[in-house]
Interface confidence: medium
């Protein structure tokens, strides 16, 4: 089930991309394997724009977080609303964009990192363990601060890019969050858009470096959602 | 540099038992996933199982076809790696590799060879 | 079982560029844009060569190069060296039971 994803505030208050989804938008890619998207399958795609119900956070896009619409409204119908930028009130972590975190009730830059080590992460595995089968369980996982005097080396487990060494950023990768280098030209990068897939993001990649975006490949217009791919390119 | 060492392997008949064992240094051991990998004399690779960082507790996962019989663990106090296989069966006989599962299994062992015949 | 299909072997002479195909369904390599690379010589470890489709590990030359389309990745090498005789295996994730999928590895001779 999507209850089973990574806690928000542990997500989502990671420098971009890190709180967004790793696939391309439309492609099981942002999905867990053999994880359905609730209420439709996971090749669907992302083009029409209508408020997305939710029951969490974590059904929401990378940019987005599930609250009722109207303020003191019906708790039981809730939507994916658009994050808050930084210096915007909240009242969790999870409302804020991704690369902020909510601080005496304002989001605030998470590149202050004034939690490192303290964050208690919940890694929730949605591939069966030895017990288990795919119907995933959930686990608190604490990362003791210990494991971060030194910064950390491409592959090595971390929270957030900051425990990472320079020119690599904190990136999920299938079972964990590692340190992977941030995308040069013509690498494949992760399109992220409004309304992005609604599903575990079980993979994640870097941001693209400097002077570089994230563009669909001139090649693979043509190409079926699914299967187009982002590369980093020049601005 | 990265280096991770296999033992443990050897000849050992059909429902018999091993225990394998993987030294690795070079890289602070405890921040990282690891994996076995194995592959059947002449044939292609295969996933068989793998552990996340923390030694109390870590989460496991395993491919089907060892599923039950087969347990990784890890010490981290030692810098080492363990596969403990039960029920052996001649399709399991093969190279065991000890991989470092950090952006896809980027180091790996020489390996261990392991086989199962009576 | 082999869950990706690869050819079983390809050939070229040195300075030519040869691909490496490897085809998958959209239950593993066409489903996740995570393709990586291994190079095995005889008798010794595979080297992670490619990963994330395209994405080149320090040390790995730049004459190998990753690239996917729908539920084919492939694997070229250009300026073929004698060194780059060797197998060469494509990995994937996928859904249901297993995790992480190989493909069968091609054999690759340099004339």
């Known amino acids: 089930t999507l209850n089973s994803v990574l806690n928000s505030n542990a997500i989502k208050n990671l420098p971009p991309p890190l709180g967004g989804a790793a696939g391309h938008p439309g492609s099981a890619v942002s999905a867990a394997p053999g994880i359905l998207y609730p209420g439709g399958n996971k090749y669907q795609t992302i083009d029409n724009y209508q408020p997305y119900p939710c029951a969490e956070d974590e059904e929401c896009g990378t940019d987005e977080y599930c609250a009722s619409p109207t303020r003191g409204g019906d708790a039981g119908v809730q939507i994916c609303l658009a994050c808050r930028k930084r210096r915007k009130r909240c009242m969790r972590h999870a409302m804020c964009c991704p690369g902020n975190y909510c601080k005496n009730g304002i989001c605030v830059s998470s590149d202050q990192n004034h939690f490192r080590g303290e964050i208690e992460e919940t890694i929730t595995e949605s591939f069966g363990n030895d017990h288990s089968t795919l119907d995933g369980y959930s686990r608190r996982t604490t990362l003791s601060s210990k494991m971060y005097h030194t910064k950390g080396q491409e592959g090595s487990v971390c929270l957030r890019s900051s425990d990472c060494a320079s020119g690599l950023c904190c990136a999920r990768h299938f079972w964990s969050k590692i340190c992977k280098p941030v995308l040069k030209e013509g690498q494949v990068c992760t399109k992220h858009r409004r309304k992005g897939s609604h599903g575990l993001e079980i993979f994640q990649r870097c941001y693209c470096g400097e002077g570089l975006s994230c563009r669909i490949q001139k090649d693979h217009h043509q190409a079926s959602n699914s299967s187009r791919l982002h590369t980093c390119q020049r601005h | 540099q990265v280096q991770l060492v296999e033992s443990g392997g050897g000849l050992v008949q059909p429902g018999g038992s091993l225990r394998l064992s993987c030294a690795a240094s070079g890289f602070t051991f405890s921040s990282y996933w690891m994996s076995w990998v194995r592959q059947a004399p002449g044939k292609g690779l295969e996933w068989v199982s793998v552990?996340?960082?923390?030694?109390?507790?870590?989460?496991?996962y395993y491919a089907a076809s060892v599923k039950g019989r087969f347990t990784i663990s890890r010490d981290n106090s030692k810098n080492t790696l363990y596969l403990q296989m039960n029920s052996l069966r001649a399709e399991d006989t093969a190279v065991y590799y000890c991989?470092?599962?950090?952006?896809?299994?980027?180091?790996w062992g020489q390996g261990t060879l392991v086989t199962v015949s009576s | 079982d082999i869950a990706l299909t690869q050819p079983a072997s390809v050939s070229g002479s040195p300075g030519q560029s040869i691909t490496i195909s490897c085809t998958g369904t959209?239950?593993?390599?066409?489903?996740?844009?995570?393709v990586s690379w291994y190079q095995q010589h005889p008798g010794k470890a595979p080297k992670l060569m490619i990963y994330?489709?395209?994405n080149r590990p320090s040390g790995v030359s730049n004459r190998f190069s990753g690239s996917k389309s729908g539920n084919t990745a492939s694997l070229t090498i250009s300026g073929l060296q004698a060194e780059d005789e060797a197998d060469y295996y494509c990995q994937s994730y996928a859904s249901g039971n297993t995790k992480v999928v190989f493909g069968g590895g091609t054999k690759l001779t340099v004339l």
């Open positions: 552990i996340e960082h923390k030694d109390k507790g870590g989460t496991t």
């Open positions: 991989a470092r599962h950090g952006i896809d299994f980027d180091h």
């Open positions: 994330d489709v395209n």
């Open positions: 959209s239950s593993d390599l066409g489903g996740y844009n995570y």
